[in-house]
C-alpha cells in the first residue's frame, strides 16, 4: 500500500511539475521591466525566452518574436535547450511511470519490469527537474548580472546595437513558476525511485515447506528435488503463503484467470 | 461615431466640491483607457488623471492626488471626477479623451470640455 | 516629471511654405522593448478640444492630410507641415505618453504670414 501511495504520489507531484515547466517555458514574463526608478511608466515591458512584449496604458499588449537564432545571447539559448530537454525527458518520464504505475496492469507485466520502469522515469524526473531548475537559475543569474539587455536591441537598424536609455529588467513570474516546478518534478522522481525499491522483487530466503513423501514422514526443503517437487522452478519469484496476514505491497500481484474479466 | 460629453462643470468656491461626469458613446467604453485633461486660462494643457478599462489602475497628477478621485461605470458607459478641495488654480476647461487602444497612449478622442470655476 | 519644451512659441508662415515646429523632452522617450518613442502632437483649433494628429512621434492618425510629418527619437522631436494651409491655422502642442504624468509642452503658435 506504501509503495503504491509513493509511486502514485511521485507520479501526480511530477505531473503538476511538468505542466509547471511547460507553463513556464511558454511564458512570456522571465523577465519584468524594473519599477523601481519609475513606478508610473505607461509603458510595462516584459520578456520571455521567446518573445518580448509591452503593455501599454491604454490596455494594449503588443508582442515581438525573436526571428533570428544567431542574433541571441548564447546565454538565452541554453535557457531554451535546457527548458526544452527538461520538458522532453519529463514527458518520456510520464510516458514510462504510466506503464511503470502499481495501479495500471499491463498484460502479464513482471514487478521487475515495473520496477525498471519506475525507476528509470524517476530519473527522468529527477533529470528534468535539475534542467528547468538549471534553466531558470541561469537566466535569473543573467539578469542579476546584468548581462541580460533587451534583445530586440540587439538586432535593430543596420545590425548596429541601439545605446539609448536601457531599460533594467527583474526576476519574472516564469522564474519562480519554473523554480517551483522544477522542484516538485525533482521531488516527484524522488518518490519514484523510493517506490522503485518497494516494487522490486526481492531474493529473499524462502520459509521451508513441509513435503510429505508417501509412507515416511520426511521434510523436504524446497529445491531439493527439482525434478520431482517442481518448486525449484516456480518458486524463485513467488513467496510461499503461510497464512498470515500481508500488505497489499508484500504480495506480489500476478495475472490470473480471474485478472481479466 | 465616438462620442464624449462633458457635464457637471460650473462656478464654485475654494474647499468646495463638484463631480463631473463624461457620458461616452460609439465604442466599448469598457475597453478604453479614459483620461481627464485640463486646460488652463492661459491656455496650457495639464494632464489631470487616468483609470484604465477595468478600473483596476487609476493615475493622478501630484497637484491633484488625494483631493480628486477618477472613476467609471462600465455599465453606464461613464467617466467621472470626483474634486474636492478645489482651489483657484484647478480653474480650467476640463476634457474628457479617451486613449487609443493603438495610439501609442495618445489621446485620439476629446469631448467638447466643461468649465470649471473656482473663485470666491 | 518630464519637461516639454516647444519652440518655438509662436510661428508666422506663408501659404504654401513648410512649417516646423520643435519639441524636446527632458527624459527620453523611446521604449527600448518594441523601439517605439512614445510622443503625440496634437493640433488645437479656437473654440474646439485638441485633435491627435500624430502618435509614436512620426505615425499619422488616420484622416490626418499627409503634409503633416513626424519625427524624431528620444529627446527630439519634430512636426512638420510640408505646405501650409490656411485651415492649418492653430495651437500645437506635444505630449509625453511614455511616462505620468502625462506632461504637454506649452505649445507654438502657429500664423499665416
Known amino acids: 500500500m506504501a509503495v503504491t501511495a509513493c509511486q502514485g504520489l511521485g507520479f501526480v507531484v511530477s505531473l503538476i511539475g511538468i505542466a509547471g515547466i511547460i507553463a513556464a517555458t511558454c511564458m512570456d514574463q522571465w523577465s519584468t521591466q524594473d519599477l523601481y526608478n519609475n513606478p508610473v511608466t505607461a509603458v510595462f515591458n516584459y520578456q520571455g525566452l521567446w518573445r518580448s512584449c509591452v503593455r501599454e496604458s491604454s490596455g494594449f499588449t503588443e508582442c515581438r518574436g525573436y526571428f533570428t537564432l544567431l542574433g541571441l545571447p548564447a546565454m538565452l539559448q541554453a535557457v531554451r535547450a535546457l527548458m526544452i530537454v527538461g520538458i522532453v525527458l519529463g514527458a518520456i518520464g510520464l510516458l514510462v511511470s504510466i506503464f511503470a504505475l502499481k495501479c495500471i496492469r499491463i498484460g502479464s507485466m513482471e514487478d521487475s519490469a515495473k520496477a525498471n520502469m519506475t525507476l528509470t522515469s524517476g530519473i527522468m524526473f529527477i533529470v528534468s527537474g535539475l534542467c528547468a531548475i538549471a534553466g531558470v537559475s541561469v537566466f535569473a543569474n543573467m539578469l542579476v548580472t546584468n548581462f541580460w539587455m533587451s534583445t530586440a536591441n540587439m538586432y535593430t537598424g543596420m545590425g548596429g546595437m541601439v545605446q539609448t536609455v536601457q531599460t533594467r529588467y527583474t526576476f519574472g513570474a516564469a522564474l519562480f513558476v519554473g523554480w517551483v516546478a522544477g522542484g516538485l518534478t525533482l521531488i516527484g522522481g524522488v518518490m519514484m525511485c523510493i517506490a522503485c525499491r518497494g516494487l522490486a522483487p526481492e531474493e529473499t530466503n524462502y520459509k521451508a515447506v513441509s513435503y510429505h513423501a508417501s509412507g515416511h514422514s520426511v521434510a523436504y526443503k524446497p529445491g531439493g528435488f527439482k525434478a520431482s517437487t517442481g518448486f525449484g522452478s516456480n518458486t524463485k519469484n513467488k513467496k510461499i503463503y503461510d497464512g498470515g496476514a500481508r500488505t497489499e505491497d508484500e504480495v506480489q500481484s500476478y495475472p490470473s484467470k480471474h485478472d481479466y474479466v | 461615431e465616438v462620442q464624449l460629453v462633458e457635464s457637471g462643470g460650473g462656478l464654485v468656491k475654494p474647499g468646495g466640491s463638484l463631480r463631473l461626469s463624461c457620458a461616452a458613446s460609439?465604442?466599448?467604453?469598457?475597453?478604453?483607457?479614459m483620461s481627464w485633461v485640463r486646460q488652463t486660462p492661459e491656455k496650457r494643457l495639464e494632464w489631470v488623471a487616468t483609470?484604465?478599462?477595468?478600473?483596476?489602475?487609476?493615475y493622478y497628477l501630484d497637484s491633484v492626488k488625494g483631493r480628486f478621485t477618477i472613476s467609471r461605470d462600465n455599465a453606464k458607459n461613464t467617466l467621472y471626477l470626483q474634486m474636492n478641495s478645489l482651489r483657484a488654480e484647478d480653474t480650467a476647461l476640463y476634457y474628457c479623451a479617451r486613449m487609443g487602444l493603438t495610439q501609442r497612449n495618445a489621446l485620439d478622442y476629446w469631448g467638447q470640455g466643461t468649465l470649471i470655476t473656482v473663485s470666491s | 516629471d518630464i519637461v516639454m519644451t516647444q519652440s518655438p512659441d509662436s510661428l508666422a508662415v506663408s501659404l504654401g511654405e513648410r512649417a516646423t515646429i520643435n519639441c524636446k523632452s527632458s527624459?527620453?522617450?523611446?521604449?527600448?522593448?518594441?523601439?517605439?518613442?512614445?510622443l503625440a502632437w496634437y493640433q488645437q483649433k479656437p473654440g474646439q478640444p485638441p485633435k491627435l494628429l500624430i502618435y509614436g512621434a512620426s505615425t499619422r492618425e488616420s484622416g490626418v492630410p499627409d503634409r503633416f510629418t513626424g519625427s524624431g527619437f528620444g529627446t527630439d522631436f519634430t512636426l512638420t507641415i510640408s505646405s501650409l494651409q490656411a485651415e492649418d491655422v492653430a495651437v500645437y502642442y506635444c505630449q509625453n505618453d511614455h511616462t505620468y504624468p502625462l506632461t504637454f509642452g506649452a505649445g507654438t503658435k502657429l500664423e499665416i504670414k
Open positions: 527624459q527620453s522617450l523611446f521604449n527600448s522593448g518594441n523601439q517605439k518613442n512614445y
Open positions: 460609439g465604442f466599448t467604453f469598457s475597453t478604453y483607457t
Open positions: 483609470i484604465v478599462g477595468g478600473g483596476g489602475y487609476t
